[in-house]
Structure formats: structure tokens, C-alpha cells
């Protein structure tokens, strides 16, 4: 039967009359920076071109005493996972391999840099279609390696990397910590994080998504028809590189930001058991397992958003944390979160010509996170409207007053150490959805955007009694752009978006004290773009056919036949 | 994912007032920084990536590398330029004694220097 990992990334249902059959990644070139590979393996023969690039640390003559098959093992397996004839994700993709890891699977930051430079020069000399670079390696945090990845990404290359197998925060490793790189953690057949004793998949805010990475059957360098199972975040990254190749082949014009948003959007949500992650990392780690889109089109109408967490601010009184969106994304809202509940809110501010989300720690606080909601909104014109703290007991309010601008998010920031001691009524006047309302001692920031066909609405869910978590979700067809809490009292730890749900966290009921200040309302701002929907319908009207799943239906048969043919 | 994670080690070597004869002082108020891997066993001391400021041309990179070699030689140190970067980042890869870091950080156009370190198959 089809290997579990290929089944897992195949969408469960699809409508065959909806879309064009893609070509399995044939328009895309995938560069692999890894060990040497066995290019004559029948899984990858004719699909992988071994470049003359080699930059590896010395091995004390190991290649002499170590079997060549072992030297080729890691790279051969990954090439097979990406584009293998029988067990590969993107069977049509062509690959180029660069040797940056020696027979022990060890390389250097400098060798990897020179490899990335080689790819950039090749791209300039002979421009081809979309490029995906797979980096199935990790070292300690490296400013220079992250910078090189950023430059290559800004040159239009999609970089996919392993989160690392250190059962640790991926932000401590490179290239996993580079914001421009798509960083992939590993899950098993039960959709649980891969673990092996003291080691296991990395996690945290620097991971974009997870993918199958345990007991993955692929090409073995033992012989040209051999297969073997391997495990690790490299295998997970190879799956995502394959999915990216499929998506880019179907839509070659996709930008990195669009691709990342699609990968997130089409992932399986909330299937990973978060209890495996350290408690402080659970909220930061995306609960996403990669999957192929159910069709090549049909996604264009969607307003795509993702949540980006900042690094922790640290505990000092004036500490701040900043969350940023990618260059092609719009910051549509900004929220903050503190485990201790001691924070001074958040604000959207301009930095280097772009809006960023800044959260403020409070005296005695253990630190805060800033949480940015980053969206793809073509032709958007967004601005922040601020109202200073109000004198009136009704609280501070601000609205979007420009013609055609809609409210996408609300933030509030305060200078007083504890808002909880001041409890004014917080009311939202009826019929004024384009308004942010907050505490009278807080300044309120409204994110107001104008974009073709953009419409937004406010959804609230209030709970009168103290509750550790209050959620409100946007319905089908709408995308969560803003997430905030009312009122901004001290027992509210913060608010953040998880997929299409706004989550407001409050302090443990037992520590809250009186129930009178227990009432919490989660406020979601849900948006959609009629403009994108129209454009997509026009596009779909001119296409017909089947889609990505057909390749996988065929693949199931191929694998089955291969399995029986050889055994 | 952030560029400015503070979890790696950063050593800022401040410029001394007695400038080296051959070195041009960097632009006022900018101090080149030195970075190394926080995981000690993964460090590769003796090999350094010298990253130059963004708009530095290849010819300037080569000139800076030669200047470092000349200044090191005057102090009795052998250095070897292993690679000159251009296309992605301006800079060069140099094999040298860690004793020369302070000197290297004072070179014109230097943004930061990073000690080489290991990466591993995952």
C-alpha cells in the first residue's frame, strides 16, 4: 500500500472537475545541499544532476575506510523523498545536488555559505523557472548563514530547512532561525512530534509547520533498487520541498510569502499533541502538518493570514518585543501575551517604512511576546489610527474614518502598571463596527485598511464568569485578521490568533480573586476579499480538469506495483 | 522567526584610540562585532567569515582581504584567504589566528566577523 507519509500529505477529499492536472513539479528545480548522492539509483536516475560543487570538512581519509554507500545515504534518501519515481512527493521535479556534508554528515557554515553563493551565481548565469533550495542541515545560531538565506530568498528563491533534531527551540539553530526560510519540524504516523530518547524534533516560533519525518521509506544507497526507512527533520523538510515544488509548478508566479501562506493554509490543523512540547513553547509552536492543496486553483480567492510571534522580550521593566511580517505581507493587527499577565499592551508602529507590532513589558513582569497577524492583501493601503487615553469614564475609542477603509485590528497600550485597579464599563456603541474600544487609561490603535473588495466584521464572545480561555472563530469563507480582549484588565494574559480562531487567555481562576473582574470578551475581526474571489472565479472559469490528487492516486498504484514487482 | 535572536554569543570588540597605521577608521559610531557559535563543541576557531557592509564591491572585498594579510604579516602572523564572497554577501573567508580579530574588526567596510562552525545532517 501507499507509504503512510505520502498518504498523510494527500488531501482527503477533492473534486476532480475543479482544476488543471499539474505536472508533479516539472517546472521547478530543487537544489539539495547535503552529502554526496548515488545518482544512478533508479528512484532518482535522470532526475538529479550532481553539480561539481563540493565543500566539506576533512575526514581523515574516511572515504577510504568508510563505505561509499554510507557517505551517500542521507542525500540519496532525501533526493528520493523529494522526487523519487515511486516514493517521492514531486515526481516531476528535477534536482541538483551540492555536497556540503561529509561522510559523517558534518559540514561547515562557511561551506554552506559558499554553496548558497554557487546557487545564486548559477541562477544569474542561467535563469530557469522557480527554484527551491533544500537545506536538510542545522548548526548553532549563525548570523551570517541567516543573512545569506535572507539574500537568496529576496532574490526569489524558496528555501526549506530542517528545524533540527535537538528537541530544543529551533530559534537557537541556523538556518532554522532565519525568518525568510520555511522551517519544518517532524511528526510521525500518529501525527505526534518525532522523538528518540533525549533527541527529537525542534519546536517553537521559528518552526513554520511540521511534516512526516519518522520511518520514511525512500531510496537507499545500498544498491540502485534498494529502499530504506530514515527519520529526522531532514525527511520532513524534504516533504515540504516536494509540496512546494508541486505548488510552484502549478502556479509558477507564487512569491515566497504566497507559498508560505498556502503551505500553512492547506496544512492539517490541531492534530499534534502539544503536551510533548515544553509548556512555555506550546503556544509558540504551530500545530500544523503539511499537506498538498486539494486543487491547483480555488485558493486564489482566499484572504491568507498567518500569526507571527516575536522573540521573548526579557523581564526588564522597559523591555519590548517586536514581531514583523515578511516584506510582501501586510500587518493587519497586533496583540500581546505575557504568562505573568504583567504587560503594558502593544502598538503598531512604523519601522523602516513598514509597520511592526511592538509589545511592552510591565514592572515585575517576566516578559512579553508581540503577536503579528500577517496577511496577503494585494494593493492594500493600511494605516494606524491612534486615540490617546480618554478622560471620560466610557473608555478610549478610535475608528477608521477614511472613506473605504475598514477595521482589521485593534491594539491598546498603557503606561500605568496595573489596569486592573481601574474598571470602567467598556461598551461598544451599536452600529459602529469600525471602532476599537478600550480602557480609558490606554491609548487605542486601530489598523485601518483599504483594499479592493475588502470587507470585515467584528465577532465577539463574552463569558461573564472567570475563564482561563475564551475563543471566538471566524466562519467559513472569512479570515481572522484581528484578535483582542475586552476589557484590558490585569487578569487578561493576552490575545493571539490560532489559525482562524481568536484566543484570549486569562490568569488561572484560583489566582484571579474576585469574580467581578472575571468577565472577558474575545473580539475577532473577520475579513474577506470579494476582489480576490472574483479574480479567482474568472480564472477557474477558464480552466478544467483534475488535479494534484490525480498524481497521488496514480502514485498509490505505482507504489503498489513497484512494491510487488520487486518483492 | 527573527534575525536578532540574542541566544548566540556576541563579542563586541571596541575600537582602541591608537589606530593602526594602515587602517582607515570605520564610519563614526559603528563598531564591527564578532560572533561565534554558542555551542562550544561546534566551534571551528581559526577560520572566520569577515562580512563587509552591504554595498561593498568585489574589488573592495579583495582589497580589504589583502590589507588584513599585509597587517597580519607585519605582526608576524600568517593568514590565508580561502574564499572571497560576492553575489550574496560581500566578504571573505580567512584562516588566521584569533589574535588578529581585534585588528580585523578595525578594517574598513567590516560589518561583522563570524567564527566558522559546524553544521550537521538532520
Amino acid at each position: 500500500s501507499i507509504p503512510w507519509n505520502l498518504e498523510r500529505i494527500t488531501p482527503p477529499r477533492y473534486r476532480a472537475d475543479e482544476y488543471q492536472p499539474p505536472d508533479g513539479g516539472s517546472l521547478v528545480e530543487v537544489y539539495l545541499l547535503d552529502t554526496s548522492i548515488q545518482s544512478d539509483h533508479r528512484e532518482i536516475e535522470g532526475r538529479v544532476m550532481v553539480t561539481d560543487f563540493e565543500n566539506v570538512p576533512e575526514e581523515d581519509g574516511t572515504r577510504f575506510h568508510r563505505q561509499a554507500s554510507k557517505c551517500d545515504s542521507h542525500g540519496t534518501h532525501l533526493a528520493g523523498v523529494v522526487s523519487g519515481r515511486d516514493a517521492g512527493v514531486a515526481k516531476g521535479a528535477s534536482m541538483r545536488s551540492l555536497r556540503v556534508l561529509n561522510c559523517q554528515g558534518k559540514g561547515t557554515v562557511s561551506g554552506t555559505l559558499i554553496g548558497l553563493e554557487f546557487i545564486r551565481k548559477s541562477q544569474l548565469v542561467q535563469p530557469v523557472g522557480p527554484l527551491v533550495v533544500l537545506l536538510p542541515l542545522a548548526g548553532g545560531y549563525s548570523r551570517v548563514l541567516n543573512a545569506a538565506c535572507q539574500r537568496l530568498a529576496r532574490a526569489g528563491v524558496v528555501l526549506v530547512t530542517a528545524a533540527g533534531n535537538f528537541r530544543d527551540d529551533a530559534c537557537l539553530y541556523s538556518p532554522a532561525s532565519a525568518p525568510e526560510v520555511i522551517t519544518v519540524g517532524a511528526t510521525n504516523a500518529q501525527d505526534q512530534p518525532v522523538t528518540l530518547g533525549t533527541l527529537g524534533t525542534n519546536f517553537g516560533r521559528c518552526v513554520d509547520l511540521f511534516a512526516p519525518g519518522e520511518d520514511i521509506i525512500g531510496a537507499s544507497s545500498d544498491c540502485s533498487t534498494c529502499f530504506v526507512s530514515q527519520s529526522g527533520t531532514s525527511q520532513a523538510a524534504a516533504h515540504v520541498a516536494g509540496i512546494a515544488a508541486m505548488m510552484l509548478s502549478a502556479e509558477p508566479e507564487l512569491t515566497l510569502a504566497e507559498l508560505r501562506q498556502r503551505l500553512i493554509h492547506f496544512s492539517a490543523k490541531d492534530v499534534i499533541n502539544e503536551a510533548w512540547f515544553p509548556e512555555d513553547q506550546r503556544v509558540l509552536t504551530p500545530n500544523l502538518v503539511a499537506a498538498l492543496p486539494p486543487s491547483t486553483h480555488g485558493a486564489g480567492w482566499q484572504l491568507f493570514c498567518r500569526t507571527v510571534w516575536s522573540a521573548h522580550s526579557g523581564p526588564t521593566r522597559m523591555a519590548t518585543a517586536v514581531a514583523r511580517c515578511a516584506p510582501d505581507e501586510e500587518l493587519l493587527s497586533c496583540s500581546s501575551f505575557s504568562r505573568s499577565g504583567k504587560r503594558r499592551g502593544e502598538r503598531m508602529e512604523a519601522q523602516g517604512g513598514k509597520l511592526v507590532c511592538r509589545a511592552h513589558n510591565a514592572f515585575g513582569g517576566e516578559g512579553v511576546y508581540a503577536i503579528a497577524r500577517c496577511c496577503l492583501l494585494p494593493q492594500a493601503n493600511c494605516s494606524v489610527h491612534t486615540a490617546p487615553p480618554a478622560e471620560a469614564s466610557m473608555g478610549t475609542r478610535v475608528h477608521c474614518h477614511q472613506q473605504g477603509h475598514v477595521l482589521t485590528g485593534c491594539s491598546s497600550h498603557w503606561e500605568v502598571e496595573d489596569l486592573g485597579t481601574h474598571k470602567p464599563p467598556v461598551l461598544r456603541p451599536r452600529g459602529q463596527p469600525n471602532q476599537c474600544v478600550g480602557h480609558r487609561e490606554a491609548s487605542i490603535h486601530a489598523s485601518c485598511c483599504h483594499a479592493p473588495g475588502l470587507e470585515c466584521k467584528v465577532k465577539e464572545h463574552g463569558i461573564p464568569a472567570p475563564q482561563e480561555q475564551v475563543t471566538v472563530a471566524c466562519e467559513e469563507g472569512w479570515t481572522l485578521t484581528g484578535c483582542s480582549a475586552l476589557p484590558g484588565t490585569s487578569h487578561v494574559l493576552g490575545a493571539y490568533a490560532v489559525d482562524n480562531t481568536c484566543v484570549v487567555r486569562s490568569r488561572d481562576v484560583s489566582t484571579t480573586g474576585s469574580t467581578s473582574e472575571g468577565a472577558v470578551t474575545a473580539v475577532a475581526i473577520c475579513c474577506r476579499s470579494r476582489h480576490l474571489a472574483q479574480a479567482s472565479q474568472e480564472l477557474q472559469g477558464s480552466t478544467s480538469g483534475s488535479g494534484l490528487n490525480d498524481i497521488f492516486e496514480a502514485q498509490k498504484i505505482e507504489w503498489h506495483e513497484h512494491h510487488h514487482h520487486h518483492h | 522567526q527573527e534575525d536578532e535572536d540574542g541566544d548566540y554569543e556576541e563579542l563586541v570588540l571596541a575600537l582602541r584610540s591608537e589606530e593602526d597605521g594602515l587602517a582607515e577608521a570605520p564610519e563614526h559610531g559603528t563598531t564591527a562585532t564578532f560572533h561565534r557559535c554558542a555551542k562550544d563543541p561546534w566551534r571551528l576557531p581559526g577560520t572566520y567569515v569577515v562580512v563587509l557592509k552591504e554595498e561593498t564591491h568585489l574589488s573592495q572585498s579583495e582589497r580589504t582581504a589583502r590589507r588584513l594579510q599585509a597587517q597580519a604579516a607585519r605582526r608576524g602572523y600568517l593568514t590565508k584567504i580561502l574564499h572571497v564572497f560576492h553575489g550574496l554577501l560581500p566578504g571573505f573567508l580567512v584562516k588566521m589566528s584569533g589574535d588578529l580579530l581585534e585588528l580585523a574588526l578595525k578594517l574598513p567596510h567590516v560589518d561583522y566577523i563570524e567564527e566558522d562552525s559546524s553544521v550537521f545532517a538532520q
Epitope: 545515504s73 559523517q104 533534531n165 521509506i217 534498494c226 530504506v228 | 538532520q122
Partner: antibody, heavy 121, light 107 residues
């Protein structure tokens, strides 16, 4: 659960051959190499070689190259090790073991219970 | 072939003792060393992989260290169930080779 179950003890005369079986269950048999390791009474462990069950690829310790044969039957998820021209110093417990690869690290994570082969005239 | 020399070949210790077993390779095997525990009449059981990584279910009192040619297995506080024979094995080069074993006995 994942396990390897080996055939029972054998007593053989010098010059004869012995064929030990190793039945795998609880995992995809063709996904992992099966290695054979022996242990003479009161002695250490000695690696004999392995088979990649997804094909018929084998690799042997030179010491046994001329006398050992490794095969597999994927329909019953079983690997076999045959040692010919037995000598008295081949008396040992023979183990099969599954090799796992994680992040470029290699190790035997599952072992059979062992098969005692006694060579005596 | 790479020779793995294990020492001591046997040692006597008491419950609670700290025990250290060493393994020396005849040439550089990097970190490509595994440690197994074997009890009489039983199959070997994986303890440490890649020189220093504890395998799933192995108690934290077991730790491994070393790289290149010198490797160490340490049991920080010996427990009654730890009396057994311990083997190191290199996988850097074929043929795989094992150390001669260290028998840990009750004093």
C-alpha cells in the same frame, strides 16, 4: 509491537550447514536492513553482515564472506542467514537485529531473542 | 578492521556507585559509537546512540561521551538492575566491530 522472532536451537556436525530464520512483525519489513551478529560462549559480539530486504542486497564481514548466505522472503517478512562448512568455533548464539537510521545516526534498535547453534561431532 | 578496546573487562561495584567504562577505537570513528547492555541469556539492549544520546526509555543515570577515538559510558548511580555486560560498537566503517565487553558485577 515491533519484534524479531528467531528459529529454535540447532545442533550440527562439523562441515554441515545451518539456516537460521528471523521473522519480523509490527513494522514495514522492507524498510529496515537486517543484520546478523553472533556471540560465542562467554565471548563478545561479532558482526557477520546484513541484508537490505527491499532488494536482495547483502554486505558481509570478509571473515564470513565465503560461507555465509543471507536471503529474505518478503511475503512472510522473514530474513534468513545460512552458514556453511560449520566448524566447532562456529558454536555461538546468532542474533538478528534491525538497523535504524535517525538523523545520520545508525544503531540496532530491535534484536531477535537469539538462536543457539552448537557444532559438535 | 577498526579494533574497539574496552576497559576494564570486568569490575565490581556496589549499588549507588558511579561506574565508568571506556572504549578506545584504533582509528578515528568520530561520534559513530553505540553502547549496548546485555544480561545473561538475553539479547543486547540499546542504551546510547551516536556516542552521547540516550535511547528512548533508558534511565537518565546512563550517559555517554567522547568522540574521535575515546569514548565513555557512565552510570551515575548504579542500580541493582544495572548489573550486566556492556558493549561499545562502532558504525563508522565496515565491518562493524564491537568492544570485548565490560562485566559489571556486585561487590
Amino acid at each position: 509491537q515491533v519484534q524479531l522472532v528467531q528459529s529454535g536451537a540447532e545442533v550440527k556436525k562439523p562441515g554441515a550447514s545451518v539456516k537460521v530464520s528471523c521473522k519480523a512483525s509490527g513494522y514495514t519489513f522492507t524498510g529496515y536492513t537486517i543484520h546478523w551478529v553472533r556471540q560465542a560462549p562467554g565471548q563478545g559480539l561479532e558482526w557477520m553482515g546484513y541484508i537490505n530486504p527491499s532488494s536482495t542486497y547483502t554486505k558481509f564481514n570478509q571473515k564470513f564472506k565465503d560461507r555465509v548466505t543471507m536471503t529474505r522472503d518478503t511475503s512472510i517478512s522473514t530474513a534468513y542467514m545460512e552458514l556453511s562448512r560449520l566448524r566447532s568455533d562456529d558454536t555461538a548464539v546468532y542474533y538478528c537485529a534491525r538497523e535504524r537510521i535517525y538523523s545520520n545516526y545508525w544503531f540496532f534498535d530491535v534484536w531477535g531473542q537469539g538462536t543457539t547453534v552448537t557444532v559438535s561431532s | 578492521d577498526i579494533v574497539m578496546t574496552q576497559s576494564p573487562s570486568s569490575l565490581s561495584a556496589s549499588v549507588g556507585d558511579r561506574v565508568t567504562i571506556t572504549c578506545k577505537a584504533s582509528q578515528n570513528v568520530y561520534w559513530e559509537v553505540v553502547w549496548y547492555q546485555q544480561k545473561p541469556g538475553k539479547s543486547p539492549k540499546l542504551l546510547i546512540y551516536s556516542a552521547s544520546n540516550r535511547y528512548t526509555g533508558v534511565p537518565s543515570r546512563f550517559s555517554g561521551s567522547g568522540s574521535g577515538t575515546d569514548f565513555t559510558l557512565t552510570i551515575s548511580s548504579l542500580q541493582p538492575e544495572d548489573f550486566a555486560t556492556y558493549f561499545c560498537q562502532q558504525y563508522s566503517s565496515y565491518p562493524y566491530t564491537f568492544g570485548g565487553g565490560t562485566k559489571v558485577e556486585i561487590k
